[in-house]
Interface confidence: low
């Protein structure tokens, strides 16, 4: 599923403000995070977790997030994909 332009703009804005005060405030409430690595071009977070970042093998710098829970690396022949997954601690 592709993201609409509004969602793209929001995601790009999130990248820009990632180091801002609002993120520091969020981090103070307590996040539980873990990394997931999968073979191929998809990595899916566990139930209840959302993607906060993606990483790709083969020096691929091109990725997108699907349904807020899955990282998709966009280069051909991807050997691995990693997702950083977080949720607010219950």
């Amino acid at each position: 599923k592709t993201l609409c332009s509004m969602e793209e703009a929001i995601n790009e804005r999130i990248q820009e403000v990632a180091g801002s005060l609002i993120f520091r405030a969020i981090s103070s409430i307590g996040l539980e995070c873990q990394s997931v690595t999968s073979r191929g071009d998809l990595a899916t977070c566990p139930r209840g977790f959302a993607v906060t970042g993606c990483t790709c093998g083969s020096a691929c710098g091109s990725w997108d997030v699907r349904a807020e829970t899955t990282c998709h690396c966009q280069c051909a022949g991807m050997d691995w994909t990693g997702a950083r997954c977080c949720r607010v601690q219950p």
Epitope: T2, S5, E8, Q15, A59, G61, S62, C73, Q74, G77
Partner: antibody
Framework: QVQLQESGPGLVKPSQTLSLTCTVS??????????WIWIRQHPGQGLEWIGD???????QYNPSLKSRVALTLDRSKNQFSLQLSSVTAADTAVYYC?????????????????WGKGTLVTVSS | SELTQDPDVSVALGQTVTITCQGD??????ASWYQQKPGQAPVLVIF???NRPSGIPDRFSGSSSGDTASLTITGAQAEDEADYYC??????????FGGGTQLTVL
């Protein structure tokens, strides 16, 4: 203003290697923000994606050409190059270089925002 | 081609015309559109389904539904007469173009 300019021989003999270079101005090929593309257009025909290269050295190729194509880049000259081996008359085309903003951290792209003017390469003995 | 376009389309000056691009990959991935005039390099007119680069008139717009992407020119001008190509990616990240549509403005 971003500009791309193709250069290389306009005539190549069959079975030889076609070599073209694209010189980029107004943007750095060392920026992670872009992939650098080669596209060709046979006379009177449509466009064909040949392949692309990222500053990291990551490449992608058209499967139909993969066995004959090599892409490289020269960061010091802000250039990237195409080599197509074992050419035949079927490789006669206008060759374009272009830029794809796909390399940005949030991975959108797969379109070509700047193009060179193109250079005609004829394969003939 | 894995992306299919009608080879020829015509439109009366000032009228609206839609050029289509069909392919299964378009169910998952955006199409982009390029305008090419004789002897010139292609020019990007629409990207990410319906975004215009700076300098492209707002009479150009894009849309998609199912396996079909569309380029619409609302109020076609004589200077819009050109070949139009769509392109998109597949799941492996390789790219392809449609066969092109020659637009004639009558």
């Amino acid at each position: 203003q971003v500009q791309l300019q193709e250069s290389g021989p306009g005539l190549v003999k069959p079975s030889q290697t076609l070599s073209l270079t694209c010189t980029v101005s107004g943007a750095s090929i060392s920026s992670g923000g872009y992939r650098w593309i080669w596209i060709r257009q046979h006379p009177g025909q449509g466009l064909e994606w040949i392949g692309d290269i990222h500053y990291s050295g990551s490449t992608q190729y058209n499967p139909s050409l993969k066995s004959r194509v090599a892409l490289t880049l020269d960061r010091s000259k802000n250039q990237f190059s195409l080599q197509l081996s074992s050419v035949t008359a079927a490789d006669t085309a206008v060759y374009y270089c272009a830029r794809d903003p796909r390399g940005h951290t949030y991975g959108y792209g797969y379109y070509f925002d700047y193009w060179g003017k193109g250079t005609l390469v004829t394969v003939s003995s | 081609s894995e992306l299919t376009q009608d080879p020829d389309v015509s439109v009366a000056l000032g009228q609206t015309v839609t050029i289509t691009c069909q392919g299964d990959r378009l169910r998952r991935y955006y199409a982009s559109w390029y305008q090419q005039k004789p002897g010139q390099a292609p020019v990007l007119v629409i990207f990410r389904k319906n975004n215009r680069p700076s300098g492209i008139p707002d009479r150009f717009s894009g849309s998609s539904s199912g396996d079909t992407a569309s380029l619409t020119i609302t109020g076609a001008q004589a200077e819009d007469e050109a070949d139009y190509y769509c392109n998109s990616r597949d799941t492996s990240g390789t790219l392809s173009f449609g066969g092109g549509t020659q637009l004639t403005v009558l």
